[in-house]
């Protein structure tokens, strides 16, 4: 089940995404996708970060925020009801089945005589809960100290987790200490 | 001590099921992210499918997507490979192994041979 | 997809002489916050599952006698063996987990000379 986003016709939508790096310059790989996360990758990118810049991107695509400080959220410029559908936010931890994905759901509505803004940046009212966890597997994975030490804070589409009860077994997978709102 | 044994390879027809199955001892599968390689004769390794450290995310190769199934049964510690619309190019040894943390595999099963043919 | 290319496809050698199999990424598998080179190699002899040597490009796994060794970063790579035993005939594959799906090399096959 998808976070609902919404934007009207010819604003700006904004698809929220975050990870917090764990040192300023060390940036992890991220991709925007139309279209859900498929398994690998992300599918019709519109949007590429790698561990220093942006590499790629679509016109009216662009990130908004400071991505160098993990905010990769998407804006997506003068939409159209042809924008509407599922938007994946992929942050390509390296490692085996390492990565986090998102699927957020974007809808546009036809434009309103007087236009309102849609940009919501305080999520606390709309995600009011705080989970944080530390996975802690067995001594032999402990490898993961190599990995790097990423908090990810994702303010999306992480109900479904919320509700596993084998969520630390995920973010042990992870090997980050990972705040859902 | 680690150890993966593997059973459930067989002669199938092109079309038909197969479920293999990967018995672990020495550790608990629901604490490792798993995963399952497969050896065409002859040729080298290709990565088939995996799953993550608590089962809740599945990962698969293209080639086999939407005809294989990944799962565990953490009661009998044990990983399955549900194989379902077989073709000739699926003939293979199938391999299960462990995977440390999300890098490499340290522990492999001894190979199950799955022979597709008409 | 990341893909992983081994040379030679085959290598013959004296026994007591050195082995160098090379593999190339064509992709970087250097994570470079972390300074890791995602990649393994592994000894397949006839009959038997594979079998770790290296991992992170250049730690022996252990157990491995120390005249493998691994080397190399970013796109380029190398598995060295610095006195070849008649024990060491097999498939040597190298393997990158820096990104889904995950690849092999297609193999370089030992043989003593």
């Known amino acids: 089940s998808e976070v609902e986003y919404r934007a009207e016709v010819g604003q700006n939508a904004y698809l929220p995404c975050f990870y917090t790096p764990a040192a300023p310059g060390n940036l992890v790989p991220v991709c925007w996708g139309k279209g859900a996360c498929p398994v690998f990758e992300c599918g019709n990118v519109v949007l590429r970060t790698d561990e220093r810049d942006v590499n790629y991107w679509t016109s009216r695509y662009w990130l908004n925020g400071d991505f160098r400080k993990g905010d990769v959220s998407l804006t997506i410029e003068n939409v159209t009801l042809a924008d509407s559908g599922i938007y994946c936010c992929r942050i390509q931890i390296p490692g085996i089945m390492n990565d986090e994905k998102f699927n957020l759901k974007l809808v546009i509505k036809p434009a309103k005589v007087t236009p309102a803004p849609t940009r919501q940046r305080d999520f606390t009212a709309a995600f009011p809960r705080m989970l944080t966890t530390r996975g802690h597997g067995p001594a032999e994975t402990q490898t993961l100290g190599s990995l790097p030490d990423i908090n990810l804070t994702q303010i999306s589409t992480l109900a479904n987790e919320l509700r596993d009860s084998r969520l630390a077994n995920d973010l042990r997978d992870s090997g980050a200490t990972i705040r859902i709102g | 001590q680690v150890q993966l044994q593997q059973s459930g390879g067989g002669l199938v027809h092109p079309g038909g099921s197969l479920r293999l199955s990967c018995a672990a001892s020495?550790?608990?599968?629901?604490?490792?992210?798993m995963t399952w390689v497969r050896q065409a004769p002859g040729k080298g390794l290709e990565w088939v499918s995996g799953?993550?450290?608590?089962?809740?995310?599945?990962y698969y190769a293209d080639s086999v997507k939407g005809r294989f199934t990944i799962s565990r049964d953490n009661s009998k510690n044990t990983l399955y490979l549900q194989m379902n619309s077989l073709r000739d190019e699926d003939t293979a040894v199938y391999y299960c192994?462990?995977?440390?943390?999300?890098?490499?595999?340290?522990?492999w099963g001894q190979g199950t041979l799955v022979t597709v043919s008409s | 997809e990341i893909v992983m290319t081994q040379s030679p496809d085959s290598l013959a050698v004296s026994l007591g002489e050195r082995a160098t199999i090379n593999c190339k990424s064509s992709?970087?598998?250097?994570?470079?916050?972390?300074?890791?080179?995602?990649l393994a190699w592994y000894q397949q002899k006839p009959g038997q599952p594979p079998k770790l040597l290296i991992y992170?490009?250049?730690t022996r796994e252990s157990g491995v006698p120390d005249r493998f060794s691994g080397s190399g970063s970013g796109t380029d790579f190398t598995l060295t063996i610095s006195s070849l035993q008649a024990e060491d005939v097999a498939v040597y594959y190298c393997q990158q987990y820096y990104s889904g799906p995950i690849t092999f090399g297609q193999g370089t096959r030992l043989e003593i000379k």
């Open positions: 992709q970087s598998v250097l994570y470079r916050s972390n300074n890791k080179n995602y």
């Open positions: 992170w490009a250049s």
């Open positions: 020495g550790f608990t599968v629901d604490t490792y992210a």
């Open positions: 192994a462990k995977i440390v943390g999300v890098t490499h595999f340290d522990y």
């Open positions: 799953i993550s450290g608590s089962g809740g995310s599945t």
